[in-house]
């Protein structure tokens, strides 16, 4: 019968011929009366056999990631009679893995959006690298993820590639972050190969800023001939938030005379001071009113940022009109 062990050949061997093992018949007594032959895909080009001894050699550099096993057939013939000594047999040569592939991130580019002020531990995104090496062969394809750029705001779980927030971020200070993740095979041991990817993390706005008046004091004038409903001037607050979170409402906080009103122009986000009652220069020619401004939409959990509304004082001077 045939005698052989399992055949393995390491990939990427640079030698011109590499001895893999020996195929022989147990009828072979070593007097060179038998001839061994190799048949099948790769026979003669990738693998050769010593016809006398049955020793098999790889004569080409192999790449496991291209082809991980070869199925060949062996024959043994009695040279004197030309007849088969053993029935033709099929055998396998397995290409064994070496760590010749670095981890690759296949889903690039990565981009994620996360609300500003999210608590520590909030999941941002999961990045995944793949390694073409053999996952069943040692640690060649066992990956560890680490953060090359992004501290102290982000962290990555070493085995899963899950990126989490590790420190609260304020969109109004910085609205996007580039995080660089490295994946290393060999679980980071010597000889490891690595690959990197960039993740763009954008912060979405939350209503963590209240509107604040641009000026703490305004001066307006109104003619005593102005009819009720007249717009006598505008006041303006700014809000570092954006979109809906920056929409505001102006109102009167203090006007003992009940002479003025404030309406909000929701397009410009300005407050328009309106004359509610006609004024009379001879009766009163100086007014002082206090206005306040608040956001239009404030979720309950963000009320802590909006405890005290910003206020401004408006001095209104009445201009005299000569009466007939």
């Amino acid at each position: 019968g045939w005698v052989w062990n399992q055949f393995f050949v390491p990939e990427e061997m640079n030698t011109t011929s590499h001895h893999i093992g020996q195929l022989r018949s147990d009828l072979d007594n070593g007097n060179n009366s038998f001839q061994y032959k190799l048949l099948g895909a790769g026979a003669g080009s990738t693998f050769i056999i010593d016809e006398r001894t049955g020793d098999i050699y790889a004569i080409q550099k192999l790449d496991r990631e291209e082809r991980s096993l070869y199925i060949l057939r062996a024959q043994v013939i009695d040279i004197a009679t030309g007849r088969a000594v053993e029935p033709e047999s099929e055998f396998v040569i397995k290409v064994s893995d070496i760590n010749d592939n670095e981890p690759k991130f296949l889903d690039e580019p990565y981009e994620a959006i996360v609300p500003e002020m999210s608590p520590e531990g909030t999941l941002v995104i999961q990045v995944t690298a793949s390694d073409a090496d053999d996952p069943s062969s040692g640690n060649n394809a066992r990956l560890l993820y680490s953060l090359l750029q992004g501290q102290p705001y982000f962290s990555v779980e070493p085995t899963t590639g899950v990126i989490r927030i590790s420190s609260k971020m304020d969109r109004e200070l910085q609205d996007e972050y580039w995080v660089i993740i490295q994946a290393k095979d060999m679980i980071g041991q010597p000889g490891a190969l690595s690959g990197t990817t960039s993740v763009l993390i954008k912060l979405s706005d939350v209503n963590d800023n209240k509107p604040i008046f641009k000026e703490s004091l305004y001066r307006l004038t109104v003619s005593e001939s102005a009819p009720t409903g007249t717009s006598i001037g505008t006041i303006m607050a700014y809000d570092n938030d954006i979109g809906e979170n920056a929409e505001m409402d102006y109102s009167i906080e203090e006007d003992d005379s009940q002479t003025f009103d404030i309406i909000t122009n929701h397009e410009t986000q300005e407050g328009i001071v309106i004359l509610k009652k006609k004024v009379d220069f001879e009766h009163q020619n100086h007014y002082g009113i206090r206005a306040k401004v608040k956001n239009h939409h404030v979720p309950e959990q963000l009320m802590k940022y909006h405890t005290e509304a910003s206020t401004t004082f408006i001095k209104i001077q009445v201009e005299d009109v000569d009466e007939p």
Partner: antibody, heavy 120, light 107 residues
Framework: QVQLQESGPGLVKPSETLSLTCTVS??????????WSWIRQPPGKGLEWIGY???????YYNPSLKSRVTISVDTSKNQFSLKLSSVTAADTAVYYC????????????WGQGTLVTVSS | EIVLTQSPGTLSLSPGERATLSCRAS???????LAWYQQKPGQAPRLLIY???SRATGIPDRFSGSGSGTDFTLTISRLEPEDFTVYYC????????FGPGTKVDIK
């Protein structure tokens, strides 16, 4: 802290024009919303408001003095000035410059005052 | 114009006593438009109270203001030696007018 300092002649002849200047330091005269006033106090008597000016040049005067008063402003020098024409002995007083408040038309900051005597 | 009348003209009290100074307007004014000043001899007036009950910066809490309509009051809860001087009320709704003053002197 805003500081105000009056300057000008201490003696003016009757029928002449009294001229005083107030120099503002520790703040800009062009600050939005603030009015700059002149107030006077005859010796041993009460206070009388003369008029005010806004940094844009808009002025408003006490109706009883309106015909004789001019208040002007020089934002480049951070100063405002008072001119009171056709003075009489009744105009002898300590003259104060003042700035109104951030929450109303009251007088929050005052100069230390300068005595102007009208006498021949 | 609005005329302000202050009473009494002179108030004689001892240190530690309570002083109540009155200011009456010739017609109704909004309480937001009244202020009180203190003036010591040879000095400029100093703002005490505005609007009519807000204390100006640095003013001790023994000074308080109240009132509405035509009647306003400045109260000094416990007179200190430095409080014996002249006090003026001022309205700033219709032009600007001052009261004639109340002198607080030591009894």
């Amino acid at each position: 802290q805003v500081q105000l300092q009056e300057s000008g002649p201490g003696l003016v002849k009757p029928s002449e024009t009294l001229s005083l200047t107030c120099t503002v330091s520790g703040g800009s005269i062009s600050s939005s919303g603030y009015y700059w006033s002149w107030i006077r106090q005859p010796p041993g008597k009460g206070l009388e408001w003369i008029g005010y000016i806004y940094y844009t040049g808009s002025a408003y005067y006490n109706p009883s003095l309106k015909s004789r008063v001019t208040i002007s402003v020089d934002t480049s020098k951070n100063q405002f000035s008072l001119k009171l024409s056709s003075v009489t002995a009744a105009d002898t007083a300590v003259y104060y410059c003042a700035r109104d408040g951030s929450s109303g038309w009251y007088f929050q900051y005052w100069g230390q005052g300068t005595l102007v005597t009208v006498s021949s | 114009e609005i005329v302000l009348t202050q009473s009494p003209g002179t108030l004689s009290l001892s240190p530690g006593e309570r002083a109540t100074l009155s200011c009456r307007a010739s017609r109704q004014i909004s309480s937001s438009y009244l202020a009180w000043y203190q003036q010591k001899p040879g000095q400029a007036p100093r703002l005490l109270i505005y609007g009519p009950s807000s204390r100006a910066t640095g003013i001790p809490d023994r000074f308080s203001g109240s009132g509405s309509g035509t009647d306003f009051t400045l109260t000094i809860s416990r007179l200190e030696p430095e409080d014996f001087t002249v006090y003026y009320c001022q309205q700033y709704g219709s032009s600007f007018t001052f009261g004639p003053g109340t002198k607080v002197d030591i009894k």
